[in-house]
């Protein structure tokens, strides 16, 4: 088990997807909208959990995503049979301080040149996508085809 | 076989600092994969997570306690301590130390045999 | 008050099956963090007897199995015998409170 070293601060980072398009927090809802003037894109917050050896190894690397400054992080829960993703309102910093790695806020974050997935721990095989025709809601996802997109473009603020 | 066994005091002065240690014996403490722990059960009452500690010095403590909870290691004396400030009566229990292994969450795999600690004038 | 519910006694009579219920939350077993049992004979220390909800470590006999569902688990004791009184223990993490947290204990007496 290797030791994490402890971090203060979670990295912050901006996201499009490969249509453009950036996502924006309407009504405590995530939504991917195309970038246009005056609009305020959320900062992400993101971490890694310091816990990987209770989790899948070679499946990326396992972080906490949240909301910059706004104490909302993002996660995944069933909804019936339906694993959805949701806003909770929870401090990234308390996460990541944890014993023990709170699965049902990690991600298996996967970066292939440019590109960035984002797959739920707690549902393997379900990723973090918006719908190709964009203004909707980020889901959760199995199907990996044309209808969603899975990838995105993540750039490290500092 | 691994053995843990604790020592100090079996009594203590209220508002004084209770001061325990675990010996292990059997393995080492140095062990990359485990945590080392400390437990509590008051007489006839359930048990209670006090905190734990990696051998690099990685301590996680119970939220409750935490003001009051310092958790050492010793690797050269395969050893780790446990300090409690300020102790009153509800602090009497059996102290028991164990080893923390891998799974999810953690679970408390090896037990020292306990000591009795009570808080008294 | 523990944050894992456990019945404060169970009985039964030798041969007999019985079973051990640990009911928890949303933050702890349901939110997908397993359940470790732990046997404590009189005057002893507790001793590991299920890890991971359904894994006996080796030397535990296998009349001892348990399960987990939602947000509770169980313990089932087959072919009960006098050895098997005891005052038994669940444990999980629950990452609200941010601790392991064990249930207040069943006292299981062998009639």
């Known amino acids: 088990m290797e030791k994490a070293l402890k971090i203060d601060t979670p990295q912050q980072g901006s996201i499009q997807d490969i249509n453009h398009r950036v996502w924006v927090l309407q009504d405590q809802t995530l939504i991917a909208v195309p970038r246009k003037d005056r609009m305020s894109p959320v900062t992400i917050a993101l971490i890694s959990c310091r816990h990987v050896e209770t989790l899948e190894k070679d499946r990326g690397n396992p972080i906490y995503l949240g909301l910059n400054g706004l104490n909302l992080c993002l996660m995944c829960a069933k909804v019936g049979d339906q694993p959805t993703l949701q806003l909770k309102e929870k401090d990234i910093m308390d996460l990541y301080n944890q014993p023990e790695p709170v699965k049902s806020f990690l991600f298996y974050h996967s970066q292939s040149g440019r590109n960035s997935t984002f797959e739920s721990v707690a549902f393997p095989g379900w990723f973090i996508a918006v719908s190709s025709e964009g203004g909707c809601p980020l889901i959760l996802t199995q199907e990996l085809g044309k209808a969603n997109t899975t990838d995105f473009g993540l750039t490290m603020l500092f | 076989q691994l053995q843990l066994q604790e020592s100090g005091p079996g009594l203590v002065k209220p508002s004084e600092t209770l001061s325990l240690t675990c010996t292990v014996s059997?393995?080492?403490?140095?062990?990359?994969?485990?945590?080392w722990g400390w437990i509590r059960q008051p007489p006839g009452k359930g048990l209670e997570w006090i905190g734990s500690i990696h051998y690099s010095g990685t301590t996680y403590y119970n939220p409750s306690l935490k003001s009051r909870v310092t958790i050492s290691v010793d690797t050269s004396k395969n050893q780790f301590s446990l300090k409690l400030s300020s102790v009153t009566a509800a602090d009497t229990a059996v102290y028991y130390c164990?080893?923390?292994?891998?799974?999810?969450?953690?679970?408390?795999?090896?037990w020292g045999q306990g000591t009795l600690v009570t808080v008294s004038s | 008050q523990s944050v894992l519910t456990q019945p404060p006694s169970v009985s039964g009579a030798p041969g007999q099956r019985v079973t051990i219920s640990c009911t928890g939350s949303?933050?702890?077993?349901?939110?997908?963090?397993?359940v470790h049992w732990y046997q404590q004979l009189p005057g002893t220390a507790p001793k590991l007897l299920i890890y991971?909800?359904?894994n006996r470590p080796s030397g535990v006999p296998d009349r001892f199995s348990g399960s987990k569902s939602g947000t509770s688990a169980s313990l089932a004791i087959t072919g009960l015998q006098a050895e098997d009184e005891a005052d038994y223990y669940c444990?999980?993490?629950?990452?609200?409170?941010?601790?392991?947290?064990f249930g207040g204990g069943t006292k299981l007496t062998v009639l």
């Open positions: 991971g909800n359904r």
């Open positions: 949303s933050s702890n077993i349901g939110a997908g963090y397993d």
């Open positions: 059997g393995g080492s403490i140095g062990s990359r994969s485990y945590y």
């Open positions: 164990a080893r923390v292994a891998p799974s999810y969450p953690r679970v408390f795999d090896y």
């Open positions: 444990q999980s993490y629950d990452y609200s409170l941010r601790v392991y947290v």
